[in-house]
């Protein structure tokens, strides 16, 4: 399976809420052998390989945020920690991913990245990961509301493949 | 901070099962996040991974040993093991428990290893 | 399976030295590969993640590179300390390693 970042830049007004959002693509297994965590972290743009580094979001790892499902199930961050910080990541069963983040500062500007691990029991496992643009504005030049610019079709580093 | 303890008889007489068990301390077995995993390293040479299991009870084997490879886990206990059957000298290893972060990947805790030998 | 093929087997160099350390891939693996340093008689010990990411607390001359099948594993300056055999490892899939590289002080 690939997973896929539908939008690759998010230009959002400051104390705007914004939802990223990956996409799980190809044959994706929904029987009950299978399980998928995921989560999303902060990273930079490294010459070689994006998403490389990993970066807590407003203070919260990739292990805070994760999420695991079954294959036929959806999920979402209920815990109390992630809300306080304004976050939540879910999952439904059509294969997107999000993350949400309420009332954005300037400080939430950056690369952010998704990661999927499908694990098939008795089987195999695979991980891939797709990154994504967040840029908060103030003043005069920012928009009234989230403006999202598709990925292009070529963009390599936005698609990883299993 | 987590401990993993491997134990179990050094020496197993060939065509005869090796049964070695990790005892785990400082964390639950029972973490949804990790998979538990045997890894051994004949004498002076590489490292093979022998197989994982999760959380749940299911298992990932190295499809050169899977059909010797047993990895049952006891929760009560905080405890997974390993058997391995038919041993032959070719078998003769240190064994190593460890821990892998399902996602972060690498195995980032290890038992110290225990010798076995396989020999009549 | 996914191979990994490390090279060299063994090396010797001075203290100070630059030592560069390579695995290769059967597949690509995207970044999902990780180092670790181990002594005689001892576990192995996690050094890098995610091909470049260095585990806390490891020291900051060691590093990683690379991505997709060609990753390389460098230490900066070689101190006596650092005599051990390394090993990669991917987890792109069902985890393999590499054959692993003896570093000798000369």
């Known amino acids: 399976f690939k997973v896929a970042t539908p939008y690759s830049l998010y230009v959002c007004p400051e104390g705007q809420n914004v939802t990223l959002t990956c996409r799980l693509l190809g044959p994706v297994d929904k029987g009950h052998d299978v399980t998928f965590y995921k989560t999303w972290y902060r990273s930079s743009r490294g010459e070689v390989q994006t998403c490389s580094e990993r970066r807590p979001i407003r203070n919260l790892t990739f292990q805070d945020l994760h999420l695991h499902h079954g294959g036929h199930q959806a999920a979402n961050t209920s815990h109390d920690l992630a809300q306080r910080h304004g976050l939540e990541s879910a999952s439904d069963h059509h294969g997107n991913f999000s993350i949400t983040m309420r009332n954005l500062t300037l400080l939430d500007s950056g690369l952010y990245c998704c990661l999927v691990v499908e694990i098939r029991h008795h089987h195999s496992e695979h991980r891939v990961h797709g990154a994504m643009e967040l840029q908060v504005q103030t003043g005069k030049d920012a928009p009234s509301n989230c403006v999202v610019y598709p990925s292009s079709s070529q963009d390599s580093e936005n698609i990883t493949a299993a | 901070q987590l401990q993993l303890q491997e134990s179990g008889p050094g020496l197993v007489k060939p065509s005869e099962t090796l049964s070695l068990t990790c005892i785990v301390s400082g964390g639950s077995i029972s973490s949804s996040g990790y998979y538990w995993g045997w890894i051994r390293q004949p004498p002076g040479k590489g490292l093979e991974w022998i197989g994982s299991?999760?959380?749940?009870?299911?298992?990932h084997y190295n499809p050169s040993l899977k059909s010797r490879v047993t990895i049952p886990v006891d929760t009560s206990k905080n405890q997974f093991s390993l058997k391995l059957s038919s041993v032959t000298a070719a078998d003769s290893a240190v064994y190593y428990c460890?821990?892998?972060?399902?996602?972060?990947?690498?195995?980032?805790?290890w038992g110290q290893g225990t010798l076995v030998t396989v020999s009549s | 399976d996914i191979q990994m093929t490390q090279s060299p087997s063994s090396l010797s160099a001075s203290v100070g030295d630059r030592v560069t350390i390579t695995c290769q891939a059967s597949q690509h693996i995207t970044n999902y590969l990780t180092w670790y340093q181990q002594k005689p008689g001892n576990a192995p010990k996690l050094l890098i993640y995610?091909?470049?990411n260095l585990e806390t607390g490891v020291p900051s001359r060691f590093s990683g590179s690379g991505s997709g099948t060609d990753f390389t594993f460098t230490i900066n300056s070689l101190q006596p300390e650092d005599v051990a055999t390394y090993f990669c490892?991917?987890?792109?899939?069902?985890?393999?390693f590499g054959g692993g590289t003896k570093v000798e002080i000369k």
């Open positions: 460890a821990r892998r972060d399902i996602l972060t990947g690498p195995f980032d805790y």
């Open positions: 490892q991917q987890y792109d899939n069902l985890p393999t």
């Open positions: 299991i999760f959380y749940s009870g299911n298992t």
């Open positions: 995610d091909a470049s």
